[in-house]
């Protein structure tokens, strides 16, 4: 998906309003210095591409992030503010049920979410630079 035409300001507002809080809740108990940020992004569409990849593409060591509440909210936000991203509104009720099923947080998942926090911060910094 090409994120060029997204409404970046509104995505930033959604991140600050809800997604960031869910990411921090997921990371609770770990320090920001526990993991090194190895993933970066250069501009707003690139940041969203990397965020989407890390959030929704399962990896062998962390397969379940897409079921987490921050992931569902990310998907809903992209559906709302990126034309052609999703055909229907993203609903939370199913997500809640799915999210409750598996609550095992592996170290590798924590590392991946740490990378996500870094990408989101980078996204906001590139937004500020443009302004």
């Amino acid at each position: 998906y090409d994120f060029t035409n997204c409404d970046f300001q509104k995505i930033e507002a959604d991140y600050l309003r809800t997604i960031s809080k869910d990411l921090i809740t997921y990371m609770s108990g770990t320090k920001s210095t526990d993991f090194n940020n190895t993933v970066s992004c250069s501009n707003r569409p690139h940041c969203l591409t990397e965020i989407q990849s890390l959030t929704f593409n399962p990896t062998p060591r962390c397969a379940s992030l897409a079921k987490e509440m921050f992931a569902r909210k990310t998907k809903a936000t992209l559906a709302l503010w990126c034309p052609g991203y999703s055909e229907t509104q993203i609903n939370a009720t199913q997500a809640m049920k799915k999210a409750r099923k598996s609550k095992v947080t592996t170290n590798k998942c924590l590392e991946q979410v740490s990378q996500l926090l870094g990408l989101w911060r980078r996204f906001i910094r590139t937004l500020l630079k443009k302004q």
Epitope: L80, S86, E87
Partner: antibody, heavy 121, light 112 residues
Amino acid sequence: EVQLVESGGGLVQPGGSLRLSCAASGFTFSNYGMTWVRQAPGKGLEWVSSITFASSYIYYADSVKGRFTISRDNAKNSLSLQMNSLRAEDTAVYYCTRGGGAYYGGSLDVWGQGVLVTVSS
Amino acid sequence: DIVMTQTPLSLSVTPGEPASISCRSSQSLLHSYGYTYLHWYLQKPGQSPQLLIYLVSYRASGVPDRFSGSGSDTDFTLKISRVEAEDVGVYYCEQTLQTPYTFGGGTKVEIK
């Protein structure tokens, strides 16, 4: 310039058929849900039908279900509304609009000029 | 179906004065992720409708800042801080939380 231009309206007898078309320009048509809205003479707005950008989801008002068919051709930037078994109460100006999907909450941010459909014997 | 009820039916306003239109839905329009699927349109005489406000309070592109939307759950308001002659027409609210999408009956605004 973002534009929607409807065509195909006219006078038709009850029980007859009509096909409305909408030509879109000035935006990436395949990224947007599309919706038909109608307005009977001197009345308010009534939602008729919506189709998502890849045609995966299609919705109809109960009043037209089974009689109207919405479709789109993303290669040709066009939207259609096939109207069969027309009734007097289908008489209205039909608007082609952009929206009705997930983007911007389904709000209709671009409207065509409208095309009049008159069902009368 | 969600029923949308607008009040008043018509409104006569002096230029420069504020105006307020109410829209009430028969059930909550709050989506599970925090947005409320309520929009406002204006249909000027002889023209197609145009989007004014989406998701309760976001102004559509090119809409003057004298227009503002507010409300939550089932009660919503469109405010015009200072009515101008070009604001005459019929105002409609619409819900897109669930199909069938439904519009309010409209509020006709005219200048005194």
